[in-house]
C-alpha cells in the first residue's frame, strides 16, 4: 500500500512537470483536481515550482468555482487548499487498496 502511494505521489508530480507541455496530461490532471477538489501534489504551492508556470498561477481546475482564467493571479480563498496525493490517496485506500 505504501509503495503504491509513493508511486502515485511521484507520478503525480511528474505529470505536473508535463502540464504546460502536454494537453493530454493537462486534461487528466484537470479532471483529477476538479473531481477531487484538490490542487497540486501536497498543496497548491507545488504549482509555483513548475518552471514554465507563472508563480501567480494555478490551473483553473484548482478553483472552487471553475471559470476560464480563474487560476490567474489567484487568491488563496478561491482555490482548493488540499493536495491531491493525500485526497486521492485517501479515496484509493478506502475504495481500491
Amino acid at each position: 500500500r505504501d509503495k503504491v502511494m509513493s508511486e502515485f505521489n511521484n507520478n503525480f508530480r511528474q505529470q505536473m512537470e508535463n502540464y504546460p507541455k502536454n494537453n493530454h496530461t493537462a486534461s487528466i490532471l484537470d479532471r483529477m483536481q476538479a473531481d477531487f477538489k484538490c490542487c497540486g501534489a501536497a498543496n497548491y504551492t507545488d504549482w509555483e515550482k513548475i518552471p514554465s508556470m507563472s508563480k501567480n498561477r494555478v490551473p483553473d481546475s484548482c478553483c472552487i468555482n471553475v471559470t476560464v482564467g480563474c487560476g490567474i493571479n489567484f487568491n488563496e480563498k478561491a482555490i482548493h487548499k488540499e493536495g491531491c496525493v493525500e485526497k486521492i490517496g485517501g479515496w484509493l485506500r478506502k475504495n481500491v487498496l
Partner: antibody, heavy 119, light 108 residues
Framework: QVQLVESGGGLVKPRGSLRLSCAAS????????MNWIRQAPGKGLEWVSY????????YYADSVKGRFTISRDNAYNSLYLQMNSLRAEDTAVYYC????????????WGQGTTVTVSS | DIQMTQSPSSLSASVGDRVTITCRAS??????LNWYQQKPGKAPKLLIY???SLQSGVPSRFSGSGSGTDFTLTISSLQPEDFATYYC??????????FGQGTRLEIK
C-alpha cells in the same frame, strides 16, 4: 470604514534596520493578499513585496531580496516589513496596499510612511 | 519580467479636453491591466481594473480599453481635479508586479 494605516518610518543610517507596520481595519484581513509598494522622491511606483492570505507565500523585488522580510499577523489584522541593511536608494514613501487578486486591482492604499536612509 | 511602457510621459491639457493615455505591455497580459491616479502628497487611487471596469465611486468620464499588449485610459472631459499622475499596472504575471513609469497630466 476600510482603512490601512502605516507606521514605523523614520530616519535611519545606511546599513541600519527599520520595521514598518500596517494596521488594517474595516474588512476581513485574511481575505486579501497584501503588498508593500514604495515611491522614491519624484519617482514612480515600485512594488517591493507581497504576501498571501495565510502568509505561506511571499515574494520580493530583486532590489530588496535577502534584506527585507514581509510578514502578517491575521489575528491582529497587521502587516509588517522588516528592513535590514538599508541603503540610500531605499529612501521612499512606503505604502501598505490591499490586493483582492484576480483582475481586480489594488483597491485600498494606506497613506504611506516615509523612510529616509542617510548618514 | 513584463515591462509596462506609458506614453506620453507628460501631457498638458485644458479643462473640458478629451485626453488619452496609452500603456503597452512587453508581452500579452490579456485584460489584467489596472489604472491608478495619484495626486501630489497622496496615495494612488484605483480608477480602472481589468482594463475597462470602472472602480466603484470613480466618475464615468474615466474609461479604459484594450487587451493583449495595448491599452488606453481616456478622460472624456477633463475636470480641474483630474490633473494628477496616472499609472498603469499589470497583474497577469507576477512577481514582480510592474507599473508603467507614469504620465503627468498638467494644466495648459
Amino acid at each position: 470604514q476600510v482603512q490601512l494605516v502605516e507606521s514605523g518610518g523614520g530616519l535611519v543610517k545606511p546599513r541600519g534596520s527599520l520595521r514598518l507596520s500596517c494596521a488594517a481595519s474595516g474588512f476581513i484581513f485574511d481575505d486579501y493578499f497584501m503588498n508593500w509598494i514604495r515611491q522614491a522622491p519624484g519617482k514612480g511606483l515600485e512594488w517591493v513585496s507581497y504576501i498571501s492570505n495565510s502568509g505561506n507565500t511571499k515574494y520580493y523585488a530583486d532590489s530588496v531580496k535577502g534584506r527585507f522580510t514581509i510578514s502578517r499577523d491575521n489575528a491582529y489584522n497587521s502587516l509588517y516589513l522588516q528592513m535590514n541593511s538599508l541603503r540610500a536608494e531605499d529612501t521612499a514613501v512606503y505604502y501598505c496596499v490591499r490586493d483582492p487578486r484576480s483582475y481586480y486591482g489594488m483597491d485600498v492604499w494606506g497613506q504611506g510612511t516615509t523612510v529616509t536612509v542617510s548618514s | 519580467d513584463i515591462q509596462m511602457t506609458q506614453s506620453p510621459s507628460s501631457l498638458s491639457a485644458s479643462v473640458g479636453d478629451r485626453v488619452t493615455i496609452t500603456c503597452r505591455a512587453s508581452q500579452s497580459i490579456s485584460s489584467y491591466l489596472n489604472w491608478y491616479q495619484q495626486k501630489p502628497g497622496k496615495a494612488p487611487k484605483l480608477l480602472i481594473y481589468a482594463a475597462s471596469s470602472l472602480q466603484s465611486g470613480v466618475p464615468s468620464r474615466f474609461s479604459g480599453s484594450g487587451s493583449g499588449t495595448d491599452f488606453t485610459l481616456t478622460i472624456s472631459s477633463l475636470q480641474p481635479e483630474d490633473f494628477a499622475t496616472y499609472y498603469c499596472q499589470q497583474s497577469y504575471s507576477t512577481p514582480p508586479i510592474t507599473f508603467g513609469q507614469g504620465t503627468r497630466l498638467e494644466i495648459k
